[in-house]
């Protein structure tokens, strides 16, 4: 009886606080008045006071909103003592799992990425890789799963789809033939990273692709 299943609490809860989560209950309360307490990080050690317990009823309380990106799981111990202070139960493990909300936008690791590719290469040639991170959970939810896309290309010569980006790896590749350094020596791509696997919050960065010279022009006399 003196057992509590893991408790899931969403991060960024609105409250009002304190919020009752679960009730600790010892069946020894039939014989004597029981007082409950909790110990551990989040209770009586840093970060203190996140959780508390109503000592006479055993209600476990949340005192403030949780942040999964700060602490994803709390491990507390529940204690039950009689009026004279004698322990009536072994300490009970209480696991509190903080569930994720999509409260962070993706962030590119750089404002501007730079890469280069030889002029005249075949479609499919890899140019560079860009990376964005998202602090949200990407294992149990899509909140932190980032999808990449190209928003725009400048200049649009010889046309506006010279490059593509792999939506999950961020690898930028040539998609069209016609790269010609003598005509366009550099392309500026505005790239996007969107969480929720493409359905959430978006952030942008720039990828500059330099077109390198190939020995494709005969000398002129």
């Amino acid at each position: 009886d003196w057992v509590v299943a893991p408790i899931s609490v969403p991060e960024n809860g609105k409250g009002p606080f304190p919020q009752r989560l679960n009730q600790l209950k010892s069946n020894k309360d039939r014989d004597t008045k029981i007082f409950y307490s909790i110990t551990g990080p989040g209770a009586d050690s840093p970060p203190e006071g996140v959780f508390a317990v109503e000592k006479e009823t055993g209600w476990l309380l949340l005192n403030k909103p949780l942040d999964r990106e700060e602490i994803a799981k709390y491990e507390l111990f529940g204690h039950a003592v009689s009026e004279n202070g004698a322990s009536v139960e072994d300490p009970m493990n209480i696991s509190i799992i903080v569930t994720d909300q999509n409260d962070h936008k993706p962030k590119f690791t750089q404002d501007t990425f730079r890469g280069s590719v030889l002029e005249g290469v075949l479609p499919g040639t890899s140019v560079m890789q860009v990376t964005a991170t998202d602090e949200d959970d990407a294992i149990y939810t899509y909140n932190g799963v980032v999808a990449y896309s190209i928003h725009s290309q400048e200049p649009k010569d010889p046309h506006d789809l010279m490059f593509t980006i792999h939506r999950s790896t961020g690898t930028i590749s040539v998609i069209s033939s016609g790269l010609d350094r003598e005509k366009v020596p550099e392309y500026t791509l505005t790239i996007q990273a969107t969480d929720m696997d493409g359905d959430g919050s978006t952030t942008t960065a720039v990828a500059v692709v330099e077109i390198l010279d190939a020995n494709d022009n005969a000398p002129m006399f």
């Epitope: 960024n12 609105k14 409250g15 009002p16 606080f17 109503e54 403030k64 942040d67 409260d103």
Partner: antibody, heavy 115, light 108 residues
Framework: EVQLVQSGAEVKKPGESLKISCKGS????????IGWVRQMPGKGLEWMGI????????RYSPSFQGQVTISADKSISTAYLQWSSLKASDTAMYYC????????WGQGTLVTVSS | EIVLTQSPGTLSLSPGERATLSCRAS???????LAWYQQKPGQAPRLLIY???SRATGIPDRFSGSGSGTDFTLTISRLEPEDFAVYYC?????????FGQGTKVEIK
């Protein structure tokens, strides 16, 4: 470091309007209720109301309902307290504070209403 | 609304003495919803105790809170010079989240 920084002191005439601010930093502004507390000269603390910046849910004390408006702009992590028509009796120090129990407080904004 | 009545209005004590401040509610308040604050002249209030007995971060252990139902107590075991101030209790179990009228602890 959690901080609540309030706008500066104001001197106004009766009948004028006013909006004072409270900017939060060092924590997730949208995840905590912000409350406003009045302290008239030489008097105690009075709970005016609270707002949840995440969705602008607002609760007022009956004593202040209709007298003031509490709002928030989550894009700039700022809560506001405003009056459409000030009275001399609104002269007081106004504090913003975070949470159900107020664990962090602003430095206060002194509002003086006098003709 | 819940009315909180603090007593005494003023407490005159010397440094090193024990201070006992009372807060009585007009109706029962769960102990988890009671807080104590300290306010010094020209300063914003500071949270001392929440949940009737839990000390806020950085509050010295000479401050302790107790009580349940309608009667709550803030105790300062040995008054330090910096403890002379006004103390307020507050309930946050129901709206409006009322404060007591305050107890001034002054140097005797």
């Amino acid at each position: 470091e959690v901080q609540l920084v309030q706008s500066g002191a104001e001197v106004k005439k009766p009948g004028e309007s006013l909006k004072i601010s409270c900017k939060g930093s060092g924590y997730s502004f949208t995840s905590y209720w912000i409350g406003w507390v009045r302290q008239m000269p030489g008097k105690g603390l009075e709970w005016m109301g609270i707002i949840y910046p995440g969705d602008s849910d607002t609760r007022y004390s009956p004593s202040f309902q209709g007298q003031v408006t509490i709002s928030a702009d989550k894009s700039i992590s700022t809560a506001y307290l405003q009056w459409s028509s000030l009275k001399a009796s609104d002269t007081a120090m106004y504090y913003c504070a975070r949470h159900s129990f107020f664990d962090y407080w602003g430095q206060g904004t002194l509002v003086t209403v006098s003709s | 609304e819940i009315v909180l009545t603090q007593s005494p209005g003023t407490l005159s004590l010397s440094p090193g003495e024990r201070a006992t401040l009372s807060c009585r509610a007009s109706q029962s308040v769960s102990s988890i919803y009671l807080a104590w604050y300290q306010q010094k002249p020209g300063q914003a209030p500071r949270l001392l105790i929440y949940g009737a007995s839990s000390r806020a971060t950085g509050i010295p252990d000479r401050f302790s809170g107790s009580g349940s139902g309608t009667d709550f107590t803030l105790t300062i075991s040995r008054l330090e010079p910096e403890d002379f101030a006004v103390y307020y209790c507050q309930q946050y179990s129901s709206s409006p989240r009322t404060f007591g009228q305050g107890t001034k602890v002054e140097i005797k």
